[in-house]
């Protein structure tokens, strides 16, 4: 009797279990009682990444420089092109269809993780003992200057945005 289910990498059509086309190939004709499934390779600008019965291959993604995109990995007949963003930019989504400039960390915040082509800058508040007085996409929080090691004393306390101000020790107290 005609099958109602087929093996892995097969599909059911007209009561026949037909072989799926392998990745990198598209379906030209279904199998029949007397013939195999016929498949053709995708053209150079196209791909199919699964065992399939698609009659058309998918176009490779275009990494549009006008959107700040560049090719990270060229597509093959079995894989799509992977785009990434140009220096100073990162993807707005996982599919990386457009890019935006990296965020800068404001004064009082330092860079916890530098941005990549696919992820934005991660900032963190400068903890006690550290400061950042610049807006930057690269600089971490810096430790306050240690006045003691310079044989100086703190004249003005540091904040998360400013370093301590050191000064000479008061000689009257000596």
């Amino acid at each position: 009797e005609p099958p109602t289910a087929c093996r892995e990498k097969q599909y059911l059509i007209n009561s026949q279990c037909c072989s799926l086309c392998q990745p990198g190939q598209k379906l030209v004709s279904d199998c029949t009682e007397f013939t195999e499934t016929e498949c053709l390779p995708c053209s150079e600008s196209e791909f199919l990444d699964t065992w399939n019965r698609e009659t058309r291959c998918h176009q490779h993604k275009y990494c549009d420089p006008n959107l700040g995109l560049q090719v990270q990995q060229k597509g093959t007949s079995e894989t799509d092109t992977i785009c990434t963003c140009e220096e100073g930019l990162h993807c707005t989504s996982e599919s990386c269809e457009s890019c935006v400039p990296h965020r800068s960390c404001l004064p009082g915040f330092g860079v916890k993780q530098i941005a990549t082509g696919v992820s934005d800058t991660i900032c963190e508040p400068c903890p006690v003992g550290f400061f950042s007085n610049v807006s930057s996409a690269f600089e971490k929080c810096r430790p306050w200057t240690s006045c003691e090691t310079k044989d100086l004393v703190v004249q003005q306390a540091g904040t998360n945005k400013t370093d301590v101000v050191c000064g000479p020790q008061d000689r009257q107290r000596a």
Epitope: S19, V28, S29, D30, T32, E33, F34, T35, E36
Partner: antibody, heavy 112, light 112 residues
């Protein structure tokens, strides 16, 4: 229901070309399948002559050398057989077939 | 070419009794995908061949379940579990794995 019907002259002179047409109904010959010509000499077995595929490409039985040509007319949903330089040995019932469905056959006699 | 050899060439069977026909190929009919394209046909007197079995063991639509096919590689068998009067005719195996397609020489089934 798929149906095939052969047509053509029943008598052909030696050294001439035998021409037969198969008209298909119930299925488009350009959709899928291989469309075959098969013959059966009187009192003998079946011999595959060749096919034309749904995409128009061909395959022929090497035993018929280069005498056989199968073509098609998709607008009429027909495919045709030409067999050149015929001899008495080409006298047979000629069938067109999709292999699951067959025509009823047409008898061709080669005689002067 | 794949030469198809059928045995026996004729058999006479009492109605209700089983019958078995063998078809042997000179080369394996299994293709690279693991599929085997071997058909069985019955040609009743004065008629076109009719498909019984395709891909070794699949009954064509409308074929009674007393007909079954089996085998692999080079050896194939058609079995009729209980022969009926309407089963008389010539049985052919046909391989369509390799070009040229080739038929067995036929097995004539008669009723005792």
């Amino acid at each position: 229901e798929v149906q095939l019907q052969e047509s053509g002259p029943g008598l052909v002179k030696p050294s001439e070309t035998l021409s037969l047409t198969c008209t298909v109904s119930g299925y488009s010959i350009s959709s899928n399948y291989y469309w075959n010509w098969i013959r059966q000499p009187p009192g003998k077995g079946l011999e595959w002559m060749g096919y034309i595929r749904y995409d128009g490409s061909n395959n022929y039985n090497p035993s018929l050398k280069s005498r056989v040509t199968i073509s098609r007319d998709t607008s009429k949903n027909q495919f045709s057989l030409k067999l050149s330089s015929v001899t008495a040995a080409d006298t047979a019932v000629y069938y067109c077939a999709r292999l699951d469905y067959w025509g009823q056959g047409t008898t061709v006699t080669v005689s002067s | 070419d794949a030469v198809m050899t059928q045995t026996p060439l004729s058999l006479s069977v009492t109605p209700g009794q089983p019958a078995s026909i063998s078809c042997r190929s000179s080369q394996s009919l299994e293709n690279t995908n693991g599929n085997t394209f071997l058909n069985w046909y019955l040609q009743k007197p004065g008629q076109s061949p009719q498909l019984l079995i395709y891909r070794v063991s699949n009954r064509f639509s409308g074929v009674p379940d007393r007909f079954s096919g089996s085998g692999s590689g080079t050896d194939f068998t058609l079995k009729i579990s209980r022969v009926e009067a309407e089963d008389v005719g010539v049985y052919y195996c046909l391989q369509v794995t390799h070009v040229p397609f080739t038929f067995g020489q036929g097995t004539k089934l008669e009723i005792k």
